[in-house]
Amino acid sequence: ESLGTEQRVVGRAAEVPGPEPGQQEQLVFGSGDAVELSCPPPGGGPMGPTVWVKDGTGLVPSERVLVGPQRLQVLNASHEDSGAYSCRQRLTQRVLCHFSVRVTDAPSSGDDEDGE
């Protein structure tokens, strides 16, 4: 699935903004990992367009930054991808989900590597 090139034509939504988002989630990834963040809308229904923001700047989808419905993927993560990520309602900038992402220099333990 190529999230980066998909465009969603959106129909009617029954939901209006739900409750305030919960606490910030802290996540650690290894260098080279794919950072995957998921943010289902409160109440389960669509809430108009959303935007992912990193350290205050809106993220534009690219070959490395893939955006899908309520989902963000940053491929081949590096230290520079560490930071505060939020999924916001585009229209109001209301934060739906908030993540603190740290990318360490070492690959994550899930990778197959030869030990010493």
Epitope: Q7, V9, V10, A13, V16, P17, T50, G58, V60, R90
Partner: antibody
């Protein structure tokens, strides 16, 4: 300086098609959400469609759903509106409107001068 | 008929304060921000107010916006002849999944 220049309007028969273009300059086009808004002669503003960079979503007004298609070519800094199965009630000046930066509250902060579409036999 | 309701006309004399109302519902104004646009005769609309009450740079402080519940208002103080224009409110509507505009208010400076 932000500039939006619409083109492609004209006279078309009912049932016909037109493609409007909006050439953008003065800002990083790919990073901004864009919309089309129309105004029938002597009438008020009506939002037609919007394309959102942040999540790739596209929205349409019920009045044009299934007939109009919004798209963009970031390499050409151009927004498009493909209009099919045109009706007399689609006659209007069509404006291209730029939204605010993605990390700010949404609003149409710049507008083009508009292009007139006339649907008549 | 527009989803957002505005009076079709308003008027005032130079120096006066004029208020234009915009009434909606919980699916738009009640749960979203309102913006206001000014359209001078024969020109494209121009942003006047956004996020209910914020003014873009370059817009005189004679223009102010407010919101209460499902209604919004645009106030113009120290009315001038160049304020004669059409004024539109707008908001996103969650149930329609799109932007909606008011029908517009034609302001006449007497």
């Amino acid at each position: 300086e932000v500039q939006l220049l619409e083109s492609g309007g004209g006279l078309v028969q009912p049932g016909g098609s037109l493609r409007l273009s909006c050439a953008a300059s003065g800002f990083t086009f790919s990073s901004y959400d864009m919309s089309w808004v129309r105004q029938a002669p002597g009438k008020g503003l009506e939002w037609v469609s919007g394309i959102y960079s942040g999540d790739g979503s596209i929205y349409y007004a019920d009045s044009v759903k299934g007939r109009f298609t919004i798209s963009r070519d970031n390499s050409k800094n151009t927004l498009y509106l493909q209009m099919n199965s045109l009706r007399a009630e689609d006659t209007a000046v069509y404006y291209c409107a730029k939204d605010a930066p993605m990390n700010e509250m949404s609003r149409f902060d710049y507008w083009g001068q508009g292009t007139l579409v006339t649907v008549s036999s | 008929q527009s989803v957002l309701t505005q009076p079709p006309s308003a008027s005032g004399t130079p120096g006066q304060r004029v208020t234009i109302s915009c009434s909606g519902s919980s699916s738009n104004i009640g749960n979203n921000y309102v913006s206001w646009y000014q359209q001078l005769p024969g020109t494209a609309p121009k942003l006047l107010i956004y996020a209910d009450s914020k003014r873009p740079s370059g817009v005189p402080d004679r223009f102010s916006g407010s919101k209460s519940g499902t209604s919004a208002s645009l106030a113009i103080s120290g009315l001038r002849s160049e304020d004669e224009a059409d004024y539109y409110c707008a908001s996103w509507d969650y149930s329609l999944s799109g932007y909606v505009f008011g029908g517009g208010t034609k302001l006449t400076v007497l």
